[in-house]
C-alpha cells in the first residue's frame, strides 16, 4: 500500500478534543491502528484507537479532558503519530507537528429554537458548544433553509460575518414547513474549517389571515 494514497487529518475543537481521520488505500480493514498525541508543553500523553468509518478510512477522538476545559493554547504544538500493529510491534505510519489553533473545527451549534414565527418571517436562535473563550467575538456563521421540494445542497447559504447567534429569515411562504441549519467557523487558523451543520430545526410559518370576503 506504499503506492496508494494516504491522508492523516486532525482538527481541534478549541477545548478538549482532537478528532483525527486516517485514510490509506489498500490497507486491511482489520488492521489495528491508533493515534498518539505528545504535547510539547503539557504533562499528559493521549492515545485513541482508530476505528473504521469506511472501506479505507479510520477515525478517532483524542479526549483531552472535560468537554469545556481549555486544554491547549495558541502556542502549543502536539506531535501526532499514527501507529499500526504489524505482528508483535507498532509501526509509525504518519507523523506531524499539530498546531491546534491552526487546525480548528468547532462542534456544531446546538439548542436551535424558534424565537418568533409569523406568516412571512421567522426568528431563530442557537448556541455554540465547547468553543474557546480565546475567540471572543471572532467567529462567523453560515445558515441555510430547506424549502419544500428542494434539497439542502440547493439551499442558498446565508453568511453572518460576526458572532451573531440568531437570524431573522424573511420572505417565507405562509403556512409552509421549513427546516433550518447553521454552522460556525473561527476566523483564526490557516487550516481551520467549518463545523458540521447543526441538527435541522423544523418550523412552520403561520397561515395567512383569511380575507373578509372569503
Amino acid at each position: 500500500a506504499v503506492n496508494g494514497t494516504s491522508q492523516f487529518t486532525c482538527f481541534y475543537n478549541s477545548r478538549a478534543n482532537i478528532s483525527c481521520v486516517w485514510s490509506q488505500d489498500g490497507a486491511l480493514q482489520d488492521t489495528s491502528c491508533q493515534v498518539h498525541a505528545w504535547p510539547d508543553r503539557r504533562r499528559w500523553n493521549q492515545t485513541c484507537e482508530l476505528l473504521p468509518v469506511s472501506q479505507a478510512s479510520w477515525a478517532c477522538n483524542l479526549i483531552l479532558g472535560a468537554p469545556d476545559s481549555q486544554k491547549l493554547t495558541t502556542v502549543d504544538i502536539v506531535t501526532l503519530r499514527v501507529l499500526c500493529r504489524e505482528g508483535v510491534r507498532w509501526r509509525v505510519m504518519a507523523i506531524q507537528d499539530f498546531k491546534p489553533f491552526e487546525n480548528l473545527r468547532l462542534m456544531a451549534p446546538i439548542s436551535l429554537q424558534v424565537v418568533h414565527v409569523e406568516t412571512h418571517r421567522c426568528n431563530i436562535s442557537w448556541e455554540i458548544s465547547q468553543a474557546s473563550h480565546y475567540f471572543e467575538r471572532h467567529l462567523e456563521f453560515e445558515a441555510r433553509t430547506l424549502s419544500p421540494g428542494h434539497t439542502w445542497e440547493e439551499a442558498p447559504l446565508l453568511t453572518l460575518k460576526q458572532k451573531q447567534e440568531w437570524i431573522c429569515l424573511e420572505t417565507l411562504t405562509p403556512d409552509t414547513q421549513y427546516e433550518f441549519q447553521v454552522r460556525v467557523k473561527p476566523l483564526q487558523g490557516e487550516f481551520t474549517t467549518w463545523s458540521p451543520w447543526s441538527q435541522p430545526l423544523a418550523f412552520r410559518t403561520k397561515p395567512a389571515a383569511l380575507g373578509k370576503d372569503t
Epitope: 506504499v2 491522508q7 487529518t9 486516517w22 490509506q24 507523523i95 506531524q96 507537528d97
Partner: nanobody, 126 residues
Framework: QVQLQESGGGSVQAGGSLRLSCVTS????????MAWFRQAPGKEREGVAI????????TYADSVKGRFTISRDNAANTLYLQMNSLKPEDTAMYYC???????????????????WGQGTQVTVSS
C-alpha cells in the same frame, strides 16, 4: 522557486561514517516535515527517516535504526543525516524530501512529499 540541494555523499569503507546535508529554499522550511529517502540500483525508492518541523519527533526505517540520525537546523534551512556504521547495503542515491502542510500520509511513501532534491550518491565498499 523551491530548491532542495543534497551534499555530503561519497565513497567510504564499511563501518565508516558520512554526514549528508540538504539545503532548502523557496518555501517555509520550518513548517515542513522533512525526510531522507534512498534508491539502490534496480530497487524502489525507500524512506530512511523523517523529522517533524519542531525537530522533536523522528522515525527511522528498521534497516537504519541505531546507525543513522536525522536532524535539522531551521535557522539555516538545512536537513542532516548522520550515517554511522555504514554497510555495503546502504549503497544508494540519497534524496531529501519535504512535505508541507497540510501534511499528507505515509511518511515512507514517495507521493506524500511535494518537493524533492536531485540526490547525492553514497557508495559503501566492503
Amino acid at each position: 522557486q523551491v530548491q532542495l540541494q543534497e551534499s555530503g555523499g561519497g565513497s567510504v569503507q564499511a563501518g565508516g561514517s558520512l554526514r549528508l546535508s540538504c539545503v532548502t529554499s523557496g518555501y517555509t522550511y520550518s513548517s515542513a516535515n522533512m525526510a531522507w529517502f534512498r534508491q539502490a540500483p534496480g530497487k524502489e525508492r525507500e524512506g530512511v527517516a523523517i523529522i517533524t518541523p519542531s525537530g522533536r519527533a523522528t522515525t527511522y526505517a528498521d534497516s537504519v535504526k541505531g546507525r543513522f540520525t536525522i536532524s535539522r537546523d531551521n535557522a539555516a534551512n538545512t536537513l542532516y543525516l548522520q550515517m554511522n556504521s555504514l554497510k555495503p547495503e546502504d549503497t544508494a542515491m540519497y534524496y531529501c524530501a519535504a512535505d508541507t502542510p497540510p501534511y499528507s500520509g505515509l511518511w515512507y511513501a514517495e507521493r506524500t512529499y511535494n518537493y524533492w532534491g536531485q540526490g547525492t550518491q553514497v557508495t559503501v565498499s566492503s
